[in-house]
Interface confidence: low
């Protein structure tokens, strides 16, 4: 069988994964025998995942491979020293193959000390008798979230059912900040309220502004380091006033001659709301009107007395026609007919003068 090497040191640059022959770091693996079935290349059951250092807290990278006679990390093309690995090995009961797992700890200082354009990275290398397998590179980055938003939402006054766009570009950060929106301190869930939509670039759209959307809106950016709130944008949904229908025309205000009639309407259909405009135009309309003046009735002159009749009376009359009452004017007051006793003419009896007898007409 061939000789295979495994690596125990961190002092070597390693681009081909073979390392240098150095007794301090390597020892020979046992030879395989021709009768043994061929061992497969190592397969990673778990590969290291990207990690973020928050404040000064170190991160752990972890991987697991089978079959693996040895397993080590290298970071930024340099092997991590054996003493910095925590290794565990067991035999998989089903396959009978050796499973090895390993973890290392990366500190903030180690990441900060790396110079060059590339981010700090680590990868796992596992050996079996068939050769070596490399895991993917896992990048380790120092997490942060800047304090200043690149764009903050601005307050708006919008009319009912208008579309509203509130813009937000979160502060720069690693990992990239997630964005959520608050409406009066409550998280907006567009799945729950379909009138809200959050765009891929973090802007909030209110599709059709409702009165209940009058509120304070805040953009919230958060990642594993921190949570930042934008300035609050107040959205006011206003309603412009609308006129009610006109009332009926009033009666003419003049009892005689020229006057006017009026009708009114109010700005209540709807009334303006949340700073909406009051109705434009007149709330009162007037038109000229003429009412015929009333004419009070007046009497004509009395007629001449009639001749003295057989009943020893004679009479005279007058008419309410000088002028007659018109347009609701007052009727004449007083007697239409007047009679009194007489003794001349055809009268057969002499009678003393008596009081006048008044006959009233209607």
């Amino acid at each position: 069988g061939s000789h295979h090497h495994h690596h125990h040191g961190s002092d070597y640059k390693d681009d081909d994964d073979k390392g240098s022959q150095d007794d301090e770091f390597f020892h020979e693996l046992p030879e395989t025998f021709p009768s043994d079935p061929p061992e497969p290349l190592p397969h990673f059951l778990i590969e290291p995942e990207e990690a973020y250092i928050v404040k000064n807290k170190p991160v752990n990278l972890y991987c697991k491979a089978s079959p693996a006679t040895q397993i080590y990390f290298k970071c930024n093309s340099e092997w991590v020293h054996q003493k910095d690995h925590v290794v565990d090995e067991r035999v998989d009961e089903t396959s009978g193959l050796i499973v090895r797992e390993v973890s290392i700890e990366i500190s903030r200082q180690q990441v900060e000390e790396l110079f060059g354009p590339e981010d700090y990275w680590c990868q796992c290398v596992a050996w079996s008798s068939a050769g070596t397998t490399k895991s993917r590179k896992a990048y380790v980055r120092i997490a942060y979230l800047r304090k200043t938003f690149e764009q903050e939402p601005l307050g708006k006054e919008v009319s009912l059912e208008q579309e509203v766009l509130l813009q937000c570009r979160p502060p720069e950060g690693i990992p990239v900040a997630e964005v959520e929106w608050l409406k009066n301190e409550d998280i907006i869930d567009p799945a729950e309220d379909r009138n809200f939509y959050i765009t891929i670039d973090h802007n909030l759209i209110i599709k059709q502004a409702r009165l209940s959307d009058t509120a304070n809106y805040t953009c919230v950016a958060k990642n594993i380091v921190a949570k930042r709130k934008s300035t609050t944008a107040t959205v006011i949904v206003y309603v412009n006033g609308g006129w009610s229908t006109w009332t009926e025309w009033s009666v003419c205000n003049s009892r005689c001659g020229r006057g006017y009639q009026k009708r009114t309407r109010t700005c209540t259909n709807p009334a303006p709301l949340n700073g909406g405009a009051f109705c434009e135009g007149q709330s009162v309309q007037k038109i000229a009107c003429t009412t015929l003046c009333p004419v009070d009735g007046r009497w004509t002159s009395w007629s001449k007395w009639s001749t003295c009749g057989t009943e020893c009376t004679h009479w005279r009359r007058r008419e309410c026609t000088a002028p007659a009452p018109k347009n609701g004017g007052k009727d004449c007051d007083g007697l239409v007919l007047q009679s009194k006793n007489c003794t001349d003419g055809l009268c057969m009896q002499a009678a003393p003068d008596s009081d006048d007898v008044a006959l009233y007409g209607s």
């Epitope: 009912l160 409702r210 209540t268 303006p272 709301l273």
Partner: antibody, heavy 119, light 107 residues
Framework: QVQLQESGPGLVKPSETLSLTCTVS????????WSWIRQPPGKGLEWIGY???????NYNPSLKSRVTISVDTSKNHFSLKLSSVTAADTAVYYC?????????????WGQGTLVTVSS | DIQMTQSPSSLSASVGDRVTITCRAS??????LNWYQQKPGKAPKLLIY???SLQSGVPSRFSGSGSGTDFTLTISSLQPEDFATYYC?????????FGGGTKVEIK
């Protein structure tokens, strides 16, 4: 003529949930904003919140964490739930109709129902 | 929240008197103010909306005026049935808020 009628228990134990229903008769529950307003004994009026038949709600921030108003247009009624009540929630609870647009005046009111919070 | 302050908190008047109640908002509310009358054991009744519009069925002796922060409810000639508590309410923004009330009593 539109009429509103509150119904629900008159006595609720502290820490429990107060539940009231307002039944609207003589008119549709659509197109208005239906509010709950309360008045502690001998005190002034406090607006609790409103709901539109579309489900849009707006609650008084001082009560928001405890209030839920819901509407059932098929039954022409709307409901109030106020959780974790204390003696300070003892009041006459009114339901009212907000005419026209959301916060316009309350032109129809229920007669009110007294809810006492006591163990 | 917009605070509504009513004054006086109570007043005594006689039938036939002219009565004026004022309401002040903590910020400008344009004309979004409503007035209600409440009698003991009864629900409030809308009198005036949008500061000066008389609600249908309310006697014309009630009138409202004002804009911005200062508002007035006037009863031109107090009638026996007008003895009650009167509340103003702003409808400019939520939460909707009421004044503390003005009790009109018989002198």
């Amino acid at each position: 003529q539109v009429q509103l009628q509150e119904s629900g228990p008159g006595l609720v134990k502290p820490s429990e949930t107060l539940s009231l229903t307002c039944t609207v008769s003589g008119g549709s529950i659509s197109s208005y904003f239906w509010s709950w307003i309360r008045q502690p004994p001998g005190k002034g009026l406090e607006w609790i919140g409103y709901i539109h038949n579309s489900g849009t709600t707006n609650y008084n921030p001082s009560l928001k964490s405890r209030v839920t108003i819901s509407v059932d247009t098929s039954k022409n009624h709307f409901s109030l739930k106020l959780s974790s009540v204390t003696a300070a929630d003892t009041a006459v609870y009114y339901c009212a109709r907000g005419r026209g647009m959301a916060t316009l005046p309350f032109d129809y009111w229920g007669q009110g129902t007294l809810v006492t919070v006591s163990s | 929240d917009i605070q509504m302050t009513q004054s006086p908190s109570s007043l005594s008047a006689s039938v036939g008197d002219r009565v004026t109640i004022t309401c002040r908002a903590s910020q400008s509310i344009s004309s979004y103010l409503n007035w209600y009358q409440q009698k003991p054991g009864k629900a409030p009744k809308l009198l005036i909306y949008a500061a000066s519009s008389l609600q249908s069925g309310v006697p014309s002796r009630f009138s409202g005026s004002g804009s911005g922060t200062d508002f007035t409810l006037t009863i031109s000639s107090l009638q026996p049935e007008d003895f009650a508590t009167y509340y103003c309410q702003q409808s400019y923004s939520t939460p909707l808020t009421f004044g503390g009330g003005t009790k009109v009593e018989i002198k």
